[in-house]
């Protein structure tokens, strides 16, 4: 149970992180291109890894045209990082009623990342409550 | 059917600044972002930059930063570059091209403008 | 930037021909190349995307190929109205670039 619980901390700092980097993304909002991203909301239930997934394939880019170039694209690669999986993530992988990627709505940048930040929010908070009722499975 | 319509030919003077229109029919305008192209002598073609319709955002190649400004009319579904400082290095014929988007990706430019001819002469 | 390098900058060639255009990256662009047609008078026209799909209404005879830095285009059995200019692009990084172009003529 011991690394099974580390595994879950470890998904639970990446997650964190995550949502450190999309914040800091946002202040450079004006230097990414605008262009339209697939921007999952209001993703059903047991779909968020799916949802999590198109957001780590959206072509988001750096206009390269500023003194933040570096920053924003060695965020722009931390934010592609594989989380550390976990069992209800392993389960979710295997469903395939779950919307595709072109399908969601298409947002730019600064709407895409408030998404993106709003999905990390939901499945930290689903974690900690399947944690709390002693299954991993929400 | 898609088209985007261009203003026409400018003959210009050194130091002037100028605007050309890109009006769109035919599709969704604040779906697609729309880019500027620059063609040099008919040949070399340069990316200029972009404009999202949908908010107004732009961005740049770092070698027409301050030289062109991209805008927009959603009312009249037309986008506009201004070019500024204008140099004889600046006669070219400029194009608008619409954005191809495929699935989630997007992937070149689909829809191009007939150009407008730029000549920048005293 | 990314430099496009395409060759040749000339071909000339024959109706029922198949001809190759060729475009090297600086570096690594992954799949994301564009090809274009453009002829006077007429609006560019966009051929293929994203390495080797093929734009909806292009003819089948256009097809690309290649990943990361080495592209081909290749038009088999050329047509007359094929003889025209063309370009590749990168859609991988920002600033966008072109290739210097290639004008197929008739031989």
């Known amino acids: 149970h011991k690394s099974s619980s580390q595994g879950q901390d470890r998904h639970m700092i990446r997650m964190r992180q995550l949502i450190d980097i999309v914040d800091q993304l946002k202040n450079y909002v004006n230097d990414l291109v605008p262009e339209f991203l697939p921007a999952p909301e209001d993703v059903e239930t047991n779909c968020e890894w799916s949802a999590f997934s198109c957001f780590q394939k959206a072509q988001l880019k750096s206009a390269n045209t500023g003194n933040n170039e570096r920053i924003i694209n060695v965020s722009i690669k931390k934010l592609k990082r594989k989380p550390p999986s976990t069992n209800a993530g392993r389960r979710q992988k295997h469903r395939l009623t779950c919307p595709s990627c072109d399908s969601y709505e298409k947002k730019p940048p600064k709407e895409f990342l408030e998404r993106f930040k709003s999905l990390l929010q939901k499945m930290i908070h689903q974690h900690l409550s399947s944690r709390t009722h002693g299954s991993e499975d929400s | 059917q898609v088209q985007l319509q261009q203003s026409g030919p400018e003959l210009v003077k050194p130091g002037a600044s100028m605007k050309i229109s890109c009006k769109a029919s035919?599709?969704?305008?604040?779906?697609?972002?729309m880019n500027w192209v620059k063609q040099s002598h008919g040949k070399n073609l340069e990316w200029i930059g972009l404009?999202?319709?949908?908010?107004?955002?732009?961005a740049y190649s770092p070698k027409f930063k301050g030289k062109a400004t991209l805008t927009v009319d959603k009312s009249s579904s037309t986008v506009y570059m201004e070019l500024l400082s204008l140099t004889s290095e600046d006669s070219a014929v400029y194009h608008c091209?619409?954005?191809?988007?495929?699935?989630?990706?997007?992937?070149?430019?689909?829809?191009w403008g007939q150009g407008t001819s730029v000549t920048v002469s005293s | 930037d990314i430099q496009m390098n395409q060759s040749p900058s000339y071909l000339a060639a024959s109706p029922g021909e198949t001809i190759t255009i060729n475009c090297r990256a600086s570096?690594?662009?992954?799949?994301?190349i564009a090809w274009y047609q453009e002829k006077p008078g007429k609006t560019n026209k966009l051929l293929i995307y994203?390495?080797?799909t093929l734009q909806s209404g292009i003819p089948s005879r256009f097809s690309g190929s290649g990943s990361g830095t080495d592209f081909t285009l290749t038009i088999s059995s050329l047509e007359p109205e094929d003889f025209a200019m063309y370009y590749c692009?990168?859609?991988?990084?920002?600033?966008?670039?072109f290739g210097a172009g290639t004008k197929l003529e008739l031989k």
């Open positions: 404009i999202n319709p949908y908010n107004g955002g732009t």
């Open positions: 035919g599709y969704d305008f604040t779906g697609y972002t």
């Open positions: 994203a390495g080797g």
């Open positions: 091209a619409r954005t191809h988007y495929y699935g989630s990706e997007y992937t070149g430019m689909d829809y």
């Open positions: 570096k690594s662009i992954e799949k994301y």
């Open positions: 692009q990168q859609h991988e990084e920002y600033p966008l670039t």
